[in-house]
């Protein structure tokens, strides 16, 4: 025959422990029911009652199956920052966290007491590391070859600009801009053409060389690209 | 010394697709652009695409885009080369090479690849 | 169009110089080009950087008697003494950005004999 389910409150068996979703209310010595999340006990049990609970008011929450007599308080409401990724409803606290653009320099059991905003990297600087929920982006100067003309906190050096003829030689803040031959151009062959915004090709060159193999100054125009001033973080 | 590994030969059958790869060593991967050619008898050499490991910029030889696609794994300094949808034409013998640096001209290629012979065959 | 126009082949006495042309677009008469040799069964290997002005820069290993020069859209590889192991393919290539558009072309080749 199968066991009789014992129905809450009951005295436990020596040595063994309450069942899931129940406590063993030291003053009645009996196991008794918990709370379920949204709820907080009302009226503890005793030796011919069970546990009485009731739903949390607002602005409070409980979370787990408890036998607490009160709910916790919501934390306060986000900061100007922050956007509220999770509401405040009975069954769980408001989580705040870092709006796009900011990372959380102090951070709580939930979400995020402190946002910063991310460091934008400046022309001639790309980032090294980006930026995450709790950590600020990394700048790193742009090496020889490879450019950023934005003030970006997402904006990597990119490589020049493939030219063959080179109107005006790349920098680290600068594209290449190459000279146009093409006949179906409205200006005349020879002429400069500016480059499109940068987002609009997906093409670009000239890689970092080595520095036991830095390129030959036979390479270079007089106007070659200068490298980025040592130390500078780019924030 | 700078050395390109290329991946070994390749018997496909028509519609399916093939991923090569090329193991760069002896210089810093991410500063060189690496360069995808396709070379069939009598067709000499064919120009599909590159890649800048460092930020993942990509050209595409326009007669090459939307059946190859070129990625790169920083991590083990190796570059990729996928290509779908496969038939007889695309069997060839496919070379990576190491863009040569240079600060103002279009540079060419120094280091190749000991080359991949893909075969599409039913 | 961006275009290496190459002859198909060319045959030569042992210790002669040879002189290979590559001419391009005429529009594209002052680019910059390389030049790749090819062995049979053998991957390219890069010879030489030619610009417009004659200028050169060759390639590691590549010996003393490969030189090159240039006349308006033609570029020229010159090899001077030539030797059995110069028997190859001789590729050019070009690149260039147009109308934001990278492109890598390579001529046809001239296929070298030394006789």
């Known amino acids: 025959l199968p066991a009789q389910v014992a129905f809450t409150p009951y005295a436990p068996e020596p040595g063994s422990t309450c069942r899931l979703r129940e406590y063993y209310d030291q003053t009645a010595q009996m196991c008794c029911s918990k709370c379920s999340p949204g709820q907080h006990a009302k009226v503890f049990c005793t030796k011919t009652s069970d546990t009485v609970c009731d739903s949390c008011e607002d602005s409070t929450y409980t979370q787990l199956w408890n036998w607490v007599p009160e709910c916790l308080s919501c934390g306060s409401r986000c900061s100007s920052d922050q956007v509220e990724t999770q509401a405040c409803t009975r069954e769980q606290n408001r989580i705040c966290t870092c709006r796009p653009g900011w990372y959380c320099a102090l951070s709580k059991q939930e979400g995020c007491r402190l946002c910063a905003p991310l460091r934008k990297c400046r022309p001639g600087f790309g980032v090294a590391r980006p930026g995450t929920e709790t950590s600020d982006v990394v700048c790193k100067p742009c090496a020889p070859g490879t450019f950023s003309n934005t003030t970006s906190s997402t904006d990597i050096c990119r490589p020049h600009q493939i030219c063959n003829v080179v109107a005006i030689p790349g920098n680290a803040s600068m594209d290449a801009v190459c000279t146009s031959t093409s006949p179906t151009r409205s200006m005349a062959p020879g002429a400069v053409h500016l480059p499109q915004p940068v987002s609009t090709r997906s093409q670009h060159t000239q890689p970092t060389p080595e520095p036991s193999t830095a390129p030959s100054t036979s390479f270079l125009l007089p106007m070659g690209p200068s490298p980025p001033a040592e130390g500078s973080t780019g924030d | 010394q700078v050395q390109l590994q290329q991946s070994g030969a390749e018997l496909v059958r028509p519609g399916t697709s093939v991923k090569m790869s090329c193991k760069a060593s002896?210089?810093?991967?991410?500063?060189?652009?690496i360069g995808w050619t396709k070379q069939r008898p009598g067709h000499g050499l064919e120009w599909i695409g590159d890649?800048?490991?460092?930020?993942?910029?990509?050209n595409y030889n326009e007669k090459f885009k939307g059946k190859a696609t070129l990625t790169a794994d920083k991590s083990s300094s190796t570059a990729y080369l996928q290509f779908s949808s496969l038939t007889s034409e695309d069997s060839a013998i496919y070379y990576c090479?190491?863009?040569?640096?240079?600060?103002?001209?279009?540079?060419?290629?120094?280091?190749w690849g000991q080359g991949t012979t893909l075969t599409v065959s039913s | 169009q961006l275009v290496l126009t190459q002859s198909s082949s060319a045959s030569f006495s042992l210790g002669a110089s040879a002189k290979l042309t590559c001419t391009l677009s005429?529009?594209?008469?002052?680019?910059?080009i390389e030049w790749y040799q090819q062995q049979p069964l053998k991957p390219p290997k890069f010879v030489m950087e030619?610009?417009?002005?004659?200028?050169?820069s060759t390639g590691d290993g590549i010996p003393d008697r490969f030189s090159g020069s240039s006349s308006g859209a033609d570029r020229y590889l010159n090899i001077s003494n030539i030797q059995p192991e110069d028997e190859a393919i001789y590729i050019c290539?070009?690149?260039?950005?147009?109308?934001?558009?990278?492109?890598?072309?390579f001529g046809g080749g001239t296929e070298v004999t030394v006789l």
């Open positions: 090479s190491r863009r040569r640096f240079t600060t103002i001209v279009a540079p060419g290629f120094d280091y």
């Open positions: 030619l610009k417009k002005d004659g200028s050169h």
């Open positions: 290539g070009v690149g260039d950005t147009i109308k934001e558009q990278f492109v890598y072309v």
């Open positions: 002896g210089y810093t991967f991410t500063n060189y652009w």
């Open positions: 005429s529009q594209h008469s002052m680019y910059t």
């Open positions: 890649i800048f490991p460092g930020g993942d910029f990509t």
